[in-house]
Interface confidence: low
């Protein structure tokens, strides 16, 4: 049966916490990803950005979880208007920004 949205969001947050807390070296070898607008459509936008990182096992689970939140199919090279134009940041910073934003959503009860 489907996982309740609150549980799914909490599990995603837990995974992001796990990634940030476990860093011993630059995440994904310091790979850069497009920064996104966190105010709307955050799950699809995040996936569209992170899906372009390959060969980084540390974020594979996050990619799968984000896929469960995004209603449409996302493939590498696909970018929505939610991307912040011409701004790239390290995966580590991207993950942490996403974590902080999702924690806010959870606190405010915005599970979808």
């Amino acid at each position: 049966s489907p996982v309740p949205p609150s549980t799914a969001l909490k599990e995603l947050i837990e995974e992001l916490v796990n990634i940030t807390q476990n860093q011993k070296a630059p995440l994904c070898n310091g790979s850069m990803v497009w920064s996104i607008n966190l105010t709307a459509g955050v799950y699809c936008a995040a996936l569209e950005s992170l899906i372009n990182v390959s060969g980084c096992s540390a974020i594979e689970k996050t990619q799968r979880m984000l896929n469960g939140f995004c209603p449409h199919k996302v493939s590498a090279g696909q970018f929505s208007s939610l991307r912040v134009r011409d701004t790239k940041i390290e995966v580590a910073q991207f993950v942490k920004d996403l974590l902080v934003h999702l924690k806010k959503l959870f606190r405010e009860g915005q599970f979808n």
Epitope: K10, N18, Q21, V100, K103
Partner: antibody
Framework: QMQLVESGGGVVQPGRSLRLSCAAS????????MHWVRQAPGKGLEWVAV????????HYADSVKGRFTITRDNSKNTLNLQMNSLRAEDTAVYYC???????????????WGQGTMVTVSS | SYVLTQPPSVSVAPGQTARITCGGN??????VHWYQQKPGQAPVLVVY???DRPSRIPERFSGSNSGNTATLTISRVEAGDEADYYC???????????FGGGTKLTVL
Amino acid sequence: QMQLVESGGGVVQPGRSLRLSCAASGFAFRTYGMHWVRQAPGKGLEWVAVIWYDGSNTHYADSVKGRFTITRDNSKNTLNLQMNSLRAEDTAVYYCARAPQWYLSAEAFDLWGQGTMVTVSS
Amino acid sequence: SYVLTQPPSVSVAPGQTARITCGGNLIGSKLVHWYQQKPGQAPVLVVYDDSDRPSRIPERFSGSNSGNTATLTISRVEAGDEADYYCQVWDHSSDHVVFGGGTKLTVL
């Protein structure tokens, strides 16, 4: 209003035991991770121990591991710290503090008690 | 175990900006919280999750965190801001909470 009130402090001889309590009110105690933090006179803050919201996990600072035990009673909204084999270096103000609970992560301490003084001296 | 390093003291004139640093290995990957403690009082949370502020804390308090340094910035410093300030993180590798040594802010 939301409140944490510590009790049980006092003067005790080295090697003896003391039990601190922290009474919580005004919030859903059972949903928060709870911590003890201490501060020796004139020194900085030192984390002592944490207990998960449901009591399922505890962690201790190396300086107190094996001597101190943190417990909670969610039915009574109470946090406890059993301190055994006390040493002079355990002399400090002991604060209880709450933190919203995420798996594998301690959140910020958004509510603190006023503290209770423990003096270990012969 | 994880170590957080703060300057013992920072001095600033009223109305100026105070910056208190907190150094730690790859601290930018951790969520940093800041506390203010006045003499004889319990600590008070002033910034959490690097840069968020509890509702009762003035906008003059802000935080940032990247690389190996987190910073608490207090703009338009007032006499009432004089206190000790502590940074704090959770160290996952040891399952311990870690505090910095504290910084005494003096308003000249």
